[in-house]
């Protein structure tokens, strides 16, 4: 697994560097997660042909994965720091159940899947410290999450492969959209 942000030898060996701002630390954390997603996607693509599946087939899934939209205030047009931050935190909280689903889906990258899950929890904590309006953040219902997890795990092999691919792709897109917005905060 890659070294978590702030723990690589270059950071330790360079005490003269300016300390990272809160935004830069969050940025590094997201990149670390994306690093992990990249490794997981490689295993998924090597193991199944999901990565070659047509966009149409992928679109016909019934997963309710978080996605950025114009109204969320995270795009340059209509950018709204507070609305956007709430959307990012809420989205990450919603992704947690899907990251839990990924935990038993990898053979050679089992550690990497765990690292992505744990790093996302840390990222959520970073972002919650940044948010002024924590009341606006809705936490997913644990019972609903538990039944969703059971349903996903009961799918046939092909659907489980498809689900894994879609989760990784959607999570990556969500984080990438978040990155540029968080740069402004």
């Amino acid at each position: 697994a890659p070294v978590p942000p702030g723990e690589d030898s270059k950071d330790v060996a360079a005490p003269h560097r300016q300390p990272l701002t809160s935004s830069e630390r969050i940025d590094k954390q997201i990149r670390y997660i994306l690093d992990g997603i990249s490794a997981l996607r490689k295993e998924t693509c090597n193991k199944s042909n999901m990565c070659e599946s047509s966009k149409e087939a992928l679109a016909e899934n019934n997963l309710n994965l978080p996605k950025m939209a114009e109204k969320d205030g995270c795009f340059q047009s209509g950018f709204n720091e507070e609305t956007c931050l709430v959307k990012i935190i809420t989205g990450l909280l919603e992704f947690e159940v899907y990251l839990e689903y990924l935990q038993n889906r990898f053979e050679s990258s089992e550690e990497q899947a765990r690292a992505v899950q744990m790093s996302t929890k840390v990222l959520i904590q970073f972002l919650q410290k940044k948010a002024k309006n924590l009341d606006a953040i809705t936490t997913p219902d644990p019972t609903t999450n538990a039944s969703l997890l059971t349903k996903l795990q009961a799918q046939n092999q092909w659907l489980q492969d498809m689900t894994t691919h879609l989760i990784l792709r959607s999570f990556k897109e969500f984080l990438q959209s978040s990155l540029r917005a968080l740069r402004q905060m």
Partner: antibody, heavy 121, light 110 residues
Framework: CQSVEESGGRLVTPGTPLTLTCTVS????????MSWVRQAPGKGLEWIGI??????STWYASWAKGRFTISKTSTTVDLKITSPTTEDTATYFC????????????????WGPGTLVTVSS | AAVLTQTPSPVSVPVGGTVTIKCQSS???????LSWYQQKPGQPPKLLIY???KLASGVPDRFSGSGSGTQFTLTISGVQCDDAATYYC???????????FGGGTEVVVK
């Protein structure tokens, strides 16, 4: 083989909107961000803006806001020059932001040859 | 918006020599998102260095980058005739999420 190519550059009169197209091959656009950069004859490079193809989120340089619109389809990224002036005469490049590779972003690692836009009355 | 100033330009260097190009930013570059590009006449730019010091794939190790914050440097050691080109730095910023290029430095190989 991965490649990027721009098209649509031509001579236009001031005020006539023009759309340039960037076509990619060997690349899943939803995995990347794509930037547009321009270069006036004999001058330096200017970053115009970027589109995160997965979400369609766009970000523009301060000077470019309102003057350009970036959009995408599944295999192309378009740059619309909303109301060209003579100062927009330049070669326009489309470049991939290599941010899918292990989280290293903000590097334009694959460029097209460019397409020339001439704005003149 | 941030301004990136490159010095010197043009710069003349003998074959086998070393050339250092500086890129100074008017504000701190976000997370050291500073990349360097080489451009030859009639061609698109080519990525050399990203995140201030990481060598891009396929780029000879005679190219190196260093710096952080507002001051960055591109060094070409053991200069070859093929290195004659214009070099640009590109910085990423948190200010309105802008990116900006430096004005370019022409390297003439004698």
């Amino acid at each position: 083989c991965q490649s990027v190519e721009e098209s649509g550059g031509r001579l236009v009169t001031p005020g006539t909107p023009l759309t340039l197209t960037c076509t990619v091959s060997g690349i899943d656009l939803s995995d990347y961000a794509m930037s547009w950069v321009r270069q006036a004859p004999g001058k330096g490079l200017e970053w115009i803006g970027i589109i995160y193809a997965g979400s369609g989120s766009t970000w523009y340089a301060s000077w470019a806001k309102g003057r350009f619109t970036i959009s995408k389809t599944s295999t192309t990224v378009d740059l619309k020059i909303t109301s060209p002036t003579t100062e927009d005469t330049a070669t326009y490049f489309c470049a991939r932001d290599g941010y899918d590779d292990y989280g290293d972003f903000d590097r334009l690692d694959l460029w097209g040859p460019g397409t020339l836009v001439t704005v003149s009355s | 918006a941030a301004v990136l100033t490159q010095t010197p330009s043009p710069v003349s260097v003998p074959v086998g020599g070393t050339v250092t190009i500086k890129c100074q930013s008017s504000q701190s570059v976000y997370n050291n998102f500073l990349s360097w590009y080489q451009q030859k006449p009639g061609q698109p730019p080519k990525l050399l260095i990203y995140q201030a010091s990481k060598l891009a794939s396929g780029v000879p190790d005679r190219f190196s980058g260093s710096g952080s914050g507002t001051q960055f440097t591109l060094t070409i050691s053991g200069v070859q005739c093929d290195d004659a080109a214009t070099y640009y730095c590109l910085g990423g910023y948190d200010d309105d999420a802008d990116n900006a290029f430096g004005g370019g430095t022409e390297v003439v190989v004698k």
